[in-house]
């Protein structure tokens, strides 16, 4: 076909962005291109063309009219991780092609097993108490908070400090005694450690 004066090659006007998403959740990688004639859009993951509903109606990935890639649910198994990777969209017309910036799709996870559960502690009243915990492996890296007798601890209280995986109570009182649970949390959800008992005895 003859080159028309008003025709121009594709250019990407909206690039996809990095995303971290939970398994089973929907997400979208955006891509928008301009060009005349209107460019066709294809997506590539780690250099390999991505199949969408245009190729297989049963696919969990849909190519939207805008060119964005919509995931009905993020699929992520113990071994197979078909959605995780580095994506680019490619816009093509007869005058050429344009490639977007890379966008990584990472799948958030939060394992069940704590790397370190807190253990029972016995202290004398007035002494400091330290409970330690390492949350389960996760992505993004889990943060932690603590519960005493199932109620979240307010670390703004001056005797209590939480640093890393350590809960430190200075100048313990009888009222500090109870069952302490470490909670690991990220965008996937929360995991409770095994409870540990703090016993405070009078000298």
């Amino acid at each position: 076909s003859r080159l028309r004066q008003e025709d121009f090659p594709p250019r990407i006007v909206e690039h996809p962005s990095d995303v971290i998403v939970s398994k089973g959740e929907p997400t979208t990688l955006n891509c928008k291109a301009e060009g005349r004639p209107t460019p066709t859009i294809e997506w590539y993951k780690d250099g390999e063309r991505v199949e969408t509903d245009k190729d297989d109606p049963r696919s969990h990935r849909m190519l939207l009219p805008s060119g964005s890639l919509f995931f009905l649910r993020i699929v992520h198994g113990r071994r197979s991780k078909p959605d995780e990777g580095s994506y680019v969209c490619v816009a093509r017309n007869y005058l050429g092609e344009a490639v977007s910036r890379n966008a990584s799709l990472e799948v958030a996870l939060l394992r069940d097993d704590f790397r370190q559960n807190p253990t029972d502690v016995v202290v004398a009243a007035g002494e400091p108490a330290i409970l330690e915990c390492q949350p389960p492996r996760g992505h993004p890296e889990p943060t932690i908070y603590w519960k005493k007798d199932k109620v979240r601890i307010d670390d703004k209280e001056e005797r209590i400090s939480i640093r890393g995986g350590k809960l430190m109570i200075s100048n313990t009182r009888k009222s500090d005694a109870g069952m302490y649970t470490c909670v690991g949390t990220n965008m996937v959800g929360e995991r409770d450690s095994d409870p540990a008992e703090l016993t405070v005895f009078e000298r």
Partner: antibody, heavy 118, light 105 residues
């Protein structure tokens, strides 16, 4: 259409090797682990191992270690299973199977009959 | 290694019957349990994954239940095309059960 197409039947002598191929199409080859499963005549299913097409990493049960090799060629989206030092009890149908992101074998090849006979 | 024990190894049933097949793991596998159907001369077909999720395109008369070590596949009303061999598989270490052959009574 998502499918796995395997190479044809083989007849081998004891002590020889066999290489079975599995051509994948209709999906992102590097996104899914490929497994090999065999079935002796009249017997059940036996898992032989997996390959991660993305990096070529493999894992096999103890029984097959040292005798099975799994490789892949990403340029032609094909996985291979090589079994050496064949014995008569290796006579079986050999299947490749894709492991889905739901941890199950959702797509299977049609099977390759390997007969080991002197 | 995790050993999967299926029972019974075979059963006879009639069209319309409710059929139950059990699978026991030698240690806890949470819900990492799949069920397959195989007909003579054919490759296995995935029916149920993650213990109770029905694979796309599989009739709703098939259902799975259980977690930990004990699992069940139920066919609510057996159809002529359901006469086949059924296998459970754990997807932690990937071993299969010995199979259950469902025959016509």
């Amino acid at each position: 259409e998502v499918q796995l197409v395997q190479s044809g039947a083989e007849v081998k002598k004891p002590g020889a090797s066999v290489k079975v191929s599995c051509k994948a199409s209709g999906y992102t080859f590097t996104g899914y682990y490929m497994h090999w499963v065999r079935q002796a005549p009249g017997q059940g299913l036996e898992w032989m191992g997996w390959i991660n097409p993305k990096d070529g990493d493999t894992e096999f049960p103890q029984k097959f270690q040292g005798r099975v090799t799994m490789t892949r060629d990403t340029s032609i989206t094909t996985a291979y299973m090589d079994l050496s030092r064949l014995r008569s009890d290796d006579t079986a149908v050999y299947y490749c199977a894709r492991e889905s992101g739901d941890d199950a074998f959702d797509i299977w090849g049609q099977g390759t009959m390997v007969t080991v006979s002197s | 290694d995790i050993v999967m024990t299926q029972s019974p190894s075979s059963l006879s049933a009639s069209v319309g019957d409710r059929v139950t097949i059990t699978c026991r793991a030698s240690q806890s596998i949470s819900s990492y349990l799949n069920w397959y159907q195989q007909k003579p001369g054919k490759a296995p077909k995935l029916l149920i994954y993650a213990a109770s999720s029905l694979q796309s395109g599989v009739p709703s008369r098939f259902s799975g239940s259980g977690s930990g070590t004990d699992f069940t596949l139920t066919i609510s009303s057996l159809q002529p095309e359901d006469f086949a061999t059924y296998y459970c598989q754990q997807s932690v270490g990937l071993s299969f059960g010995g199979g259950t052959k469902v025959e016509i009574k």
